[in-house]
């Protein structure tokens, strides 16, 4: 309607005696701005004055007067939007109606507002939600229509009497809509609150208690067990009998079912609150529970771990690894089911106690060959000794052991012979596949590991083998000795260091470079015939006639070995010279006749002169003097010298006879 | 029967070098599971472990002495040498050489020599 | 490295008495313990090895228990020549390690 004017506020305010009472309040006006204002008590309209009867509370007026009244009332508000009051204190008479007469320069308005003092301070609300299930988060809510801007107030939440640990989230409100306090508590309830008392209480600001509200919480849940046990420690021996009771310590709604469960599987025929086992059995060792359902759901109790007590079973060997190389770790694992844990364990070697090794585990950090073998071993406990179960093997690889080679033949071995070697070893793991030798040679192996040389050469000295599986392991070479007969043979001459002279003193020398065995025999020989068995041969004063081809013999057991032939040269000056006539010492005149000087001498003669019976040297240096034609006066006794490097030579006189011809006698 | 037999100087010097010998006999350092092992005694003190080698010459050391300690074998002599160096007199002791037991690990030093007393003094 | 405390450093004991010498471990091992009895002037003999197995030639009056860090020797009735220091040892972890020694004297 056009013709109203427009206010807004709460409709009804509420506060009790001596607090305040805050009214949030605007307004528009029909036509300009407010010029008087006035608040009445229970305002009652006068038909005959036309105006408003009632106890002023407040008034405004054009000239400013204020009555005294206004000290505890004041209008917060303004001329045109504002018409907000305050009432401070609030006294119990004020209830009722209030009345804002509002005047502008044309119109006049009579806004009603209802006011509730109650005596002392009224209670708070809680709110709860429709349904409250354990640890499910709700919001608890408690609300006061109340708040003043000059009384603060504070909600305080209890549990049972106790201020509640949550944090509560207070918020006022002081608007045209609403005038409010609230507390809201985020809270999530637990089974055992069900039932419980929770309080919003309402304090002034120094904490005094003012009013509060109270609920009982209906906190929906599964159903709480409790489980007890016979014996309570849930320890018990092979055949042994065990009680166990389920008892309900709460449940919301009432509960429907019982079962029982077993390492979390139900157990078949077991619908009463008491579970009862007889002469029970190892396998009944386990956790156990109970478990009871409502509308809400199934509620569990703690488990009771119960414990058959048994001697332990018999033990398996794990090996961490098999199989271990030679020098590896490995660790053995005796595993053994008992209750209590075993706490003695003893381990055995193929039958044989392990002395000092009586834990669960044994760590060997360096695997030897001698360690392979069977392992077993013994759990104990204090109900008993377990048995001895099969054993874990343990297999070691290493590589080939003590790899000796073997001369197969007889000794000694000979220069030629067929040697045949093996390759020998004390033990392997895994097995031998192949062998190598050294040094290499184009050598025939017959077999696996047998090594045959075919005419054994004399400086075949040692030969080693290897035997290999996965590693090769080398024996020491072993020496052949292979014997032969000597070698190298040869003349050396000693003395004297140059050529040799006729008189000279000479040494020979037989050497020979090796010989296997080392003792030999010499043989000197000229011509086939035997000269001496001395390593040297010795001439004080040689003469030309020692000049000639000469071979020594070394021998030992197994043969004998001759030099090449080694030519001994004397030098001497040219001797035995003698003049030769050709064609003989009687020549007929006018024929030809040929002298010719001879001699034994080494170097030949390099040089000749010839000499006459008077010891004229004649004018001829060559070997053989030609007379041709010879005359009578030819003859006489001839002589011839012969010179070579070492010296010279002279031969005797050797006559040339010339007789006359028969033409020559004729004539005469 | 297996015996070790201790043999080094009665008397060194500070700041020199101890070298101690270990002969053992009646059985090869060469075997297999074969391990000598040096401990000293200070005059009325307890005993302390120094150093072992084992047949495949693996060494261990005392953490304290490590950077002073060396030791080694000799297969051809049968001998286990220590060498110690900068000697002080707080190193005056008695100096056991053992052999380790090694079974199914290791074991405890099972055959002691008779000890060579050693005394650190300028 | 592993730390071994021998108690008491003393016992005084009468012949024909028992006696309880303890070891205890600075960290849990194995049982690779070892007690050796020691005379004036000899060198230590091996008693016990894997803390509680006897060496060749140890009378059985000498007993080795224990696992964790607490080991024990006892000697059930003392004779003469039992009285020494005993030494226990570990070798589990490297370096090696002897505990302080207790001297058995007669009471």
């Known amino acids: 309607d056009s013709s109203k004017w427009v206010f807004e506020h709460p409709e009804t305010l509420y506060a009790w005696e001596g607090a305040c009472v805050w009214i949030p309040c605007t307004y528009r006006a029909l036509d300009g701005d407010l010029e008087s204002f006035i608040l009445f008590h229970n305002p009652e309209y006068n038909k005959n004055t036309s105006k408003f009867d009632g106890t002023r509370l407040y008034e405004s007026t054009k000239d400013g007067k204020v009555p005294s009244e206004q000290k505890r009332v004041q209008f917060l508000g303004d001329k045109n939007k504002n018409c907000t009051l305050s009432i401070h204190p609030v006294h119990l008479n004020d209830s009722g109606q209030l009345g804002l007469r509002m005047e502008s320069k044309t119109e006049k308005w009579m806004e009603r507002i209802h006011l509730n003092v109650s005596e002392r301070p009224f209670p708070p609300h809680i709110q709860l939600p429709p349904e409250i299930q354990e640890s499910q988060e709700v919001t608890l809510t408690c609300l006061l229509n109340f708040s003043c801007y000059g009384y603060p107030i504070q909600l305080q939440w209890l549990l049972e009497g106790v201020p509640m640990r949550q944090a509560a989230v207070t918020s006022t409100s002081l608007t045209i809509k609403s005038v409010f306090t609230r507390s809201e508590l985020k809270f999530s309830p637990q089974w055992s609150h069900h039932g419980k008392i929770v309080t919003c209480q309402l304090q002034d600001a120094d904490g005094k208690f003012l009013s509060n509200d109270t609920v009982q919480l209906n906190v929906k849940h599964t159903p709480k067990l409790e489980i007890k046990v016979t014996p309570s420690d849930a320890i018990v021996r092979e055949g042994d009998s065990v009680t166990m009771t389920c008892e309900v310590s709460s449940s919301n709604p009432e509960y429907t079912t019982v079962s029982w469960l077993k390492d979390g599987t139900s157990l078949k025929k077991q619908n009463t609150f008491t579970l009862n086992l007889r002469e029970v059995t190892k396998d009944q060792s386990g956790k156990y529970c109970c478990q009871v359902s409502n509308d809400v759901g199934p509620g569990r109790s703690e488990e009771v771990f119960l414990q058959v007590q048994y001697a332990p079973e018999p033990s398996t060997v794990q090996i961490l690894h098999s199989p271990a190389v030679e020098g590896s770790q490995v660790e053995f694992l005796c595993m053994s089911l008992a209750n209590p844990l075993p706490t003695n364990y003893t381990w055995y070697h193929n039958g044989k106690e392990m002395q000092g090794r009586t834990e669960e585990k044994v760590h060997i950090p360096k695997i030897l060959p001698w360690h392979a073998g069977t392992y077993s071993c013994v759990a104990e406990n204090i109900l008993g000794t377990g048995q001895r179960g099969p054993g874990a093997e343990l297999d070691v690889q290493y590589p080939p052991k003590k790899v000796t080679t073997v001369i197969q033949n007889p000794m000694p071995i000979r220069e030629g012979d067929t040697v045949t070697l093996s390759c020998n070893y004390n033990s392997s793991n895994p097995s031998v596949t192949r062998y190598e030798w050294k040094p290499h040679g184009a050598w025939e192996e017959p077999s696996l590991g047998v090594l045959k040389i075919q005419n054994v050469g004399w400086d075949n000295t040692t030969i080693a083998c290897a035997a290999c599986n996965s590693w090769c392991s080398w024996a020491s070479p072993v020496a052949l000795n292979v014997q032969y007969a000597p070698r190298d043979v040869r003349v050396r001459k000693i003395k004297p260091l140059s050529e040799i002279h006729s008189g000279n003193s000479v040494s020979l020398q037989c050497d020979f470079s090796s010989s296997h065995p080392k003792e030999v025999q010499f043989f000197w020989e000229k011509n086939g015939r035997l000269l001496g068995k001395e390593s040297q041969l010795n001439f004080d004063s040689i003469s030309p006639e020692d000049a000639g081809s000469y071979s020594c013999w070394v021998n030992n057991s197994i043969g004998q070995t001759a030099s090449k032939a080694w030519t001994l040269e004397v030098l001497y000056a040219p001797r035995r010279l003698r003049v030769s006539m050709s064609p003989g010492d009687q020549v007929m005149e006018g024929k030809s006749a040929t002298l010719t000087c001879e001699s034994d001498a080494n170097p030949p003669v390099s040089h000749y002169t010839w000499f006459d019976w008077n010891n004229q040297s004649l004018p001829y240096h060559s070997q053989k003097l030609r007379l041709e034609p010879v005359k009578v006066q030819h003859s006489g006794a001839y002589w011839c010298q012969g010179t070579n490097s070492v010296g010279k030579g002279r031969s005797p006189l050797s006559t040339l006879t010339v007789y006359y011809s028969p033409e020559t006698i004729g004539r005469r | 029967q297996v015996t070790l037999r201790e043999s080094g100087p009665a008397l060194v010097k500070p700041t020199q070098t101890l070298t101690l010998t270990c002969t053992l006999s009646?059985?090869?350092?060469?075997?297999?599971?074969?391990?000598v092992t040096w401990i000293r005694q200070p005059p009325g003190k307890a005993l302390e472990w120094l150093a072992l080698?084992?047949?495949?010459?693996?060494?261990y050391y005392s953490t304290s002495l490590k950077t002073r300690l060396t030791i080694s074998k000799d297969t051809s002599k049968n001998q286990v040498v220590l060498t110690m160096t900068n000697m002080d007199p707080v190193d005056t002791a008695t100096y056991y050489c053992?052999?380790?037991?090694?079974?199914?690990?290791?074991?405890?030093?099972?055959?002691w020599g008779q000890g060579t007393m050693v005394t650190v003094s300028s | 490295e592993v730390v071994m405390t021998q108690s008491p450093a003393t016992l005084s004991v009468s012949p024909g008495e028992g006696a309880t010498l303890s070891c205890r471990a600075s960290?849990?091992?194995?049982?690779?313990i070892a007690w050796y009895q020691q005379k004036p002037g000899q060198a230590p003999r091996l008693l016990i090895f894997?803390?509680?197995a006897r060496a060749t030639g140890i009378p059985a009056r000498f007993t080795g228990s224990g696992s964790g860090t607490e080991f024990t020797l006892t000697i059930s009735s003392l004779q003469s020549e039992d009285f020494a220091v005993y030494y226990c040892q570990q070798y589990n972890n490297w370096p090696l390690t002897f505990g302080g020694g207790t001297k058995v004297e007669i009471k």
């Open positions: 009646g059985l090869p350092l060469s075997t297999s599971g074969m391990a």
């Open positions: 960290q849990s091992g194995s049982r690779n």
């Open positions: 053992a052999r380790m037991g090694y079974s199914y690990g290791w074991d405890a030093f099972d055959l």
């Open positions: 080698i084992d047949w495949d010459d693996d060494k």
């Open positions: 894997g803390a509680s």
